[in-house]
């Protein structure tokens, strides 16, 4: 059965940021600011119709 | 550096995997100036069944 939704897994490096333990804790300012910037960025990139949103953001050391 | 992993959702049939990657890659320069994020090593793949329940007839 089709859900009517396509999902894509996307991964990328941010080379001018340093990973630290606060990116493992969603309650920290660093985590929340980066998540907000990334979410806003994706809304800009895929602003044409069809984009439903993003989920499961994870940060890892590069 | 920081590796970011996430899942994007689109209405079915509105974008292919190539355009997901291309549109993101074309935005990298603006991401650097607007968000001060230097992005590299972009990788995109479709999330396989059963997560997206994609394989049935539409």
């Amino acid at each position: 059965l089709s859900t009517g939704v396509s999902f894509f897994f996307l991964s990328f490096h941010i080379s001018n940021l340093q990973f630290n333990s606060s990116l493992e804790d969603p309650s920290t300012d660093y985590y929340q600011e980066l998540q907000r910037d990334i979410s806003e960025m994706f809304l800009q990139i895929y602003k044409q119709g069809g984009f439903l949103g993003l989920s499961n953001i994870k940060f890892r050391p590069g | 550096s920081v590796v970011v992993q996430l899942t994007l959702a689109f209405r079915e049939g509105t974008i292919n995997v190539h355009d997901v990657e291309t549109q993101f890659n074309q935005y990298k320069t603006e991401a650097a100036s607007r968000y001060n994020l230097t992005i590299s090593d972009v990788s995109v793949s479709d999330v396989p069944f059963p997560f997206s329940a994609q394989s049935g007839a539409g």
């Epitope: - | 049939g13 292919n16 995997v17 190539h18 539409g58």
Partner: antibody
Amino acid sequence: QVQLVQSGAEVKKPGASVKVSCKASGYTFTTYTMHWIKQAPGQGLEWIGYINPGSDYTHYNQKFKDKVTLTADKSASTAYMELYSLRSEDTAVYYCARQGNYAAYYFDYWGQGTLVTVSS
Amino acid sequence: DIQMTQSPSSLSASVGDRVTITCRASGNIHNFLVWYQQKPGKSPKLLVYNAKTLTDGVPSRFSGSGSGTQYSLTISSLQPEDVATYYCQNFWNVPFTFGSGTKLEIK
């Protein structure tokens, strides 16, 4: 109405280059991606690559990346495909084809084709 | 790269016959599958996109179906003007590969 009109047939010697044009009319040239397709005599269709005339972004089939350059002239609403270092296996009909607009994953209009013959 | 395997390579059928051409992708192409018709000496013409959507002006005897890796084009009642070569195309990911074609003839 939408039209893609390609330049005429060419005969070239091995090692030479050729530039094929595709003049678009009847729509806004910069808002549709233009693709190029090869069809060798009696053979099937082979995708070469595309150009987005609005941004000049190009993407090539790896097989053709050292063989072809795609360009576009916005002011003339014309797309170009230049083939380099021609060999006999480059003899083919080359088509330009417009990709439909947003979320349109198909070629809705095709040029009439340009026959490029490579012969010594 | 996604390979598109089209079958049969040629087909001879009678006027009024039901004809089916199949196309198998080497990976899931999520219905980003297009069918074109090419008559001798002419440019290809769009028939079906998104695996099953008929383009404007194409007779309703043509239909597309399938999902995942398996797709087909059916002509419910073959007409003389349907003599042509039919190609499928992957539009899921680059390179946007074509099938090798099916040459359809009238018996």
